[in-house]
Amino acid sequence: ATKLTEEKYELKEGQTLDVKCDYTLEKFASSQKAWQIIRDGEMPKTLACTERPSKNSHPVQVGRIILEDYHDHGLLRVRMVNLQVEDSGLYQCVIYQPPKEPHMLFDRIRLVVTKGFSGTPGSNENSTQNVYKIPPTTTKALCPLYTSPRTVTQAPPKSTADVSTPDSEINLTNVTDIIRVPVFN
């Protein structure tokens, strides 16, 4: 069984989520990759994807999401800029490998976006918020639509574990087939 884990990011409106998803270089370098949100009780929804085949270090921008696939490093970089409270949720990277179902990359990202600057531990009350406007200069790629009724999977339950520290890791559940997920736009 595979241990499904997630890392929690607590950010403020206007900030940037900047994360990486590692993948096996030899196997997936040119495969199309996607960034998905998983809402409770729903299928994962693809928000952005790289081109097909995926181009090395070529930024793809969909709204406030920027994807960069570094083939030579075996990592997909995902940035969500100018975060909004509504961006809060559980996210994951997947690799498209038709005709097979998408392959999920670990770890998942639990994003919590809050308004303003509160006095929570590890943050600062008097910092000014950054609202950064990104120029729409990059490419938007079309994401494939996958349907696969036999892998309908509910999103994992929200963990009640204390995950306030950077090293926190939530062990959601032991799963076997959950790593293959269908994708809906």
């Epitope: 900030q15 940037t16 590692d22 920027i66 570094y70 990592l75 600057f117 910092s127 990104i134 950077p166």
Partner: antibody, heavy 121, light 105 residues
């Protein structure tokens, strides 16, 4: 607790190679990138590259391409940085550092104590 | 190649506020970290994700960002804060600013 312990100081002649080790403890070695940063006397921090201990893959700063090799031995949770064709301006303290999280490349929350490498004829 | 620009030096009187800036292209899209380094010691992370403090870092250290400029602010500066400070960001590669020497007069 997380610890990165580096090998001792080295004195090398120009043209030689040096291999610095960084032994990790207190966490799952495969889960976090290890970076190498150097600092010449009186100078700032200079990033040399990162190592993905899980895959063994590395990413080197352009300046060091062709001269640096980063490897690891997962059985002993140790990362290595080898710099070849040493010159006098490679004299510096070399640090290994660990990512704060598994899903980010920066910042570096944990640092080794540093290894002084002196290149002198 | 990507560069982060810091002032070489900043001076402040004890108890006053010190501000160190770091600017770079598209820094608004990137998370900024700040490190403190005292002579003969390894760097210490004092701010990450623009404005968060790791545990153990005093509250007088704060970070902010406006557009493409990040700022490290030390309020009520103490003699022990005298050190070199470096900003850091991830472009295609990891980049450090040139460093700022903070002198507490």
């Amino acid at each position: 607790q997380v610890q990165l312990v580096q090998s001792g100081a080295e004195v090398k002649k120009p043209g030689a190679s040096v291999k610095v080790s960084c032994k990790a403890s207190g966490y799952t070695f495969n889960g976090y990138y290890i970076h190498w940063v150097r600092q010449a006397p009186g100078q700032g921090l200079e990033w040399m590259g990162w190592l993905n201990p899980n895959s063994g893959g590395a990413n080197y700063a352009q300046k060091f391409q062709g001269r640096v090799t980063m490897t690891r031995d997962t059985s002993i949770s140790t990362a290595y940085m080898e710099l070849s064709r040493l010159r006098s301006d490679d004299t510096a303290v070399y640090y290994c550092a660990r990512d704060q999280r598994k899903t980010t490349v920066t910042p570096f929350e944990y640092w080794g104590q540093g290894t002084l490498v002196t290149v002198s004829s | 190649s990507y560069e982060l620009t810091q002032p070489p030096s900043v001076s402040v009187s004890p108890g006053q506020t010190a501000s160190i800036t770091c600017s770079g292209d598209k820094l608004g899209e990137r998370n900024v970290g700040w490190y403190q380094q005292k002579p003969g010691q390894s760097p210490v992370l004092v701010i990450y994700q623009d404005n968060k403090r790791p545990s153990g870092i005093p509250e007088r250290f704060s970070g902010s960002k406006s557009g493409n400029t990040a700022t490290l602010t030390i309020s009520g500066t103490q003699a022990m804060d005298e050190a070199d400070y470096y900003c850091q960001a991830w472009d295609r590669n990891v980049v450090f600013g040139g460093g700022t020497k903070l002198t507490v007069l």
